[in-house]
């Protein structure tokens, strides 16, 4: 007859570190010692005829336990497989690239330490709640990977790793562990450089707008822009509209920046950079400055007119050029009445990078001279009819401008000058027309001959 040695429970499942009560029993009619063969920590709790009960403690790993006993000159054994389940100690998604180019693959890598039984442990890689990959946990530590094609939609998406210990067949349920999520940042940076709109020339101490635009950028709001004139960073205002980024700044040139310079626009996104550069010449264009030796000259005096400008500037004063660029143009004259109010024009020309820049300036000369009455404008003999309207057309000149009055000889009667008035016979007579100023007097005699009105 064959006798059996039963081990109970058969193939139990318990959580890591737990204890298990094991009973070995035989129907062999012997009083033999039953041994429990295991590397686990064990204690004989009780024994009797054909049975022994043991307590196993701190069961940390899968184990096969064996009971053996002598029976009728042979050794009989019985075994049971202990399955220990334990949740992973660590479930971690490896760091994602700080920035991932759209349209390129990246690898999700999840490491799982611990967790048993491995045959029941599955590792799932997720984007939001979408399963990207589901694989069994194999080695220790288990490493599971998935290759993902980055898209715009992935920007800001959380990726995570989940473990599922399926102990449902053993009636223990599904145990889930999830890693801390990691957020992906995706980007699109076109290969084309930005469009840079900047002046070719910039005068010292003047300002000019600079625009830098790049299209097809994603996410445009995350891009960094650097605008600079030479080594001077410009304070840019950055605007995004859809996938277009525009940076605007005002470039102001300093005196120490004179010469050939570059305007640079750098757009950085996802650790990559696109750059545009434009050449710009910073120039200084002083003048032209026109000077009079006497802004207000006396008639007959000598007046010097000069025109000057900065270095490398060619000046021309009233059509007379300076001897060389950077030199002063000059002319001299004896001030006459006809020079009063005369304007002197100076033009300045500067060559910057093959382009000629022009500037003009003028000054007006004042000549002081005594009063005069122009005989051509003031008839000395007037024949008018009584009871008609007339104007005494007389004009005085002089600097300072004289006051002109026409008074009837032998009386204080004054006739208006340059204003229409009603003529009658009483106006008949000789008039002293006098122009007077601080520079003297000038008198002209005008005779008014009034013809009496005839009734027939």
């Amino acid at each position: 007859q064959e006798f059996l040695l039963r081990v109970e429970p058969q193939n139990p499942v318990l959580s890591a570190g737990g204890s298990l009560f094991v009973n070995c029993s035989t129907d062999c009619p012997s009083s033999e010692k039953i041994a429990l063969e295991t590397s686990l920590s064990k204690e004989l709790v009780a024994s009797g005829m054909g049975w022994a009960a043991f307590n196993l403690s701190n069961v940390t790993g899968n184990s096969r336990i064996l009971c053996s006993v002598y029976c009728n000159g042979s050794q009989i054994t019985g075994s049971s497989n202990i399955t220990v389940y334990g949740l992973p100690e660590r479930v971690e998604l490896a760091p994602l690239p700080p920035w991932q180019p759209v349209g390129q693959n990246f690898t999700l890598r999840c490491q799982v330490e611990g967790g048993s039984p491995r045959t029941s442990l599955t590792v799932v890689l997720l984007r939001w709640e979408e399963e990207l990959s589901r694989q069994p946990a194999v080695e220790e530590p288990a490493e599971v990977t998935a290759t993902v094609l980055a898209s715009r939609d992935d920007h800001g998406a959380p990726f995570s790793c989940r473990t599922e210990l399926d102990m449902q067949p053993q009636g223990l349920g599904l145990f889930v562990n999830t890693s801390a999520p990691r957020q992906l940042r995706t980007f699109v940076l076109p290969v084309t450089p930005p469009r840079l709109v900047a002046p070719r020339f910039l005068e010292v101490e003047t300002s000019w707008p600079v625009d830098c635009t790049l299209d097809g950028l994603f996410p445009a709001s995350e891009a960094q822009v650097y605008l600079a004139l030479g080594d001077q960073m410009l304070n840019a205002t950055v605007m995004n509209h859809g996938d277009t980024l525009t940076a605007t700044a005002t470039a102001t040139a300093r005196a120490d920046q004179e010469g050939a310079r570059e305007i640079v626009c750098n757009v950085t996104l996802g650790g990559e950079r696109r750059e545009a550069r434009e050449n710009l010449t910073v120039f200084s264009f002083l003048g032209p400055i026109v000077n009079l030796s006497e802004p207000t000259a006396h008639e007959g005096s000598t007046v010097t007119v000069s025109c000057m400008a900065g270095a490398r500037v060619q000046v021309t004063l009233d059509g007379v050029p300076a001897a060389a660029p950077g030199q002063t143009a000059q002319l001299q004259l004896n001030a006459t009445e006809s020079d009063d109010g005369r304007s002197f024009f100076c033009s300045a020309t500067l060559e910057v990078d093959g382009e000629f820049l022009h500037r003009n300036s003028s000054v007006q000369l004042r000549v002081l001279y005594g009063p005069k009455i122009d005989r051509a404008t003031c008839p000395q003999h007037l024949k008018w009819k009584d009871k008609t309207r007339h104007v005494l057309q007389c004009q005085a000149r002089g600097n300072p401008y004289p006051e002109l009055r026409c008074l009837k000889e032998g009386s204080s009667r004054e006739v208006p000058v340059g204003i229409p008035f009603f003529v009658n016979v009483t106006h008949n007579g000789t008039y002293q027309c006098q122009a007077s100023s601080s520079r003297g007097k000038y008198t002209l005699v005008v005779v008014m001959d009034i013809e009496a009105f005839s009734s027939h």
Epitope: E32, K33, A35, E37, S47, S68, Q75
Partner: antibody
Framework: QVQLQQSGAELAKPGASVKMSCKAS????????MHWVKQRPGQGLEWIGY????????EYNQRFQDKATLTADKSSSTAYMQLSSLTSEDSAVYYC????????????WGQGTSVTVSS | DIQMTQSPSSLSASVGDRVTITCSAS?????IYWYQQKPGKAPKLLIY???NLASGVPSRFSGSGSGTDFTLTISSLQPEDFATYYC?????????FGQGTKLEIK
């Protein structure tokens, strides 16, 4: 008839290892557990451990856990004990003994192997 | 560990004497075994399961006891009985022996 034949005396230097054998005959080797017992000169008996040749399962006295290694070769019906990192304290006679069951106890003993540790 | 303590450690007696050796366990055991060892020889099983004589052992030897206290009695000492006697338990690991009782000729 049942016999346990042990290997001859050993002379070893401190720090060395020795491996002694116990050849069983006259019974089915894999049925019975083989125990090993130490006896220092003029001293009592001290249990080292046992091996189940059927399963190669071993249990040791905690005091000998790092000193003795028990093995068995089913094909030659021979049990072995290796002693490592020898010191003068290991100088003793070592016996193998068959556990014949509860109704027999340690019913058959080998003649003993003498181990002398000396520099 | 269960300690087994024998008394006396040694004893002198004459042929024909009745001798009793006791063995005390530090905690309760179900049964014990007794062995006889002569100088230069391996131990020999005398009594199993506390009171049963091993095959070939003379009937002058007997064993008794339970729990923690056990005895080995030799009813009439014979010259070949002068040896060292050991008790042994195996309720739990480690298996332990008493320190031995040396029986000498008076």
């Amino acid at each position: 008839q049942v016999q346990l034949q042990q290997s001859g005396a050993e002379l070893a230097k401190p720090g060395a290892s020795v491996k002694m054998s116990c050849k069983a005959s006259g019974y089915t080797f894999t049925v019975y557990w083989m125990h090993w017992v130490k006896q220092r000169p003029g001293q009592g008996l001290e249990w080292i451990g046992y091996i189940n040749p059927n399963t190669d399962y071993t249990e040791y006295n905690q005091r000998f856990q790092d000193k003795a290694t028990l093995t068995a070769d089913k094909s030659s019906s021979t049990a072995y004990m290796q002693l490592s990192s020898l010191t003068s304290e290991d100088s003793a006679v070592y016996y193998c003994a068959r556990w014949g069951g509860n109704s027999y106890g340690l019913d058959y003993w080998g003649q003993g192997t003498s181990v002398t540790v000396s520099s | 560990d269960i300690q087994m303590t024998q008394s006396p450690s040694s004893l002198s007696a004459s042929v024909g004497d009745r001798v009793t050796i006791t063995c005390s366990a530090s905690s309760s055991v179900s049964y014990i075994y007794w062995y006889q060892q002569k100088p230069g020889k391996a131990p020999k099983l005398l009594i199993y399961l506390t009171s049963n004589l091993a095959s070939g052992v003379p009937s002058r030897f007997s064993g008794s006891g339970s729990g923690t206290d056990f005895t080995l009695t030799i009813s009439s000492l014979q010259p070949e009985d002068f040896a060292t006697y050991y008790c042994q338990q195996w309720k739990s690991i480690p298996l332990t022996f008493g320190q031995g009782t040396k029986l000498e000729i008076k």
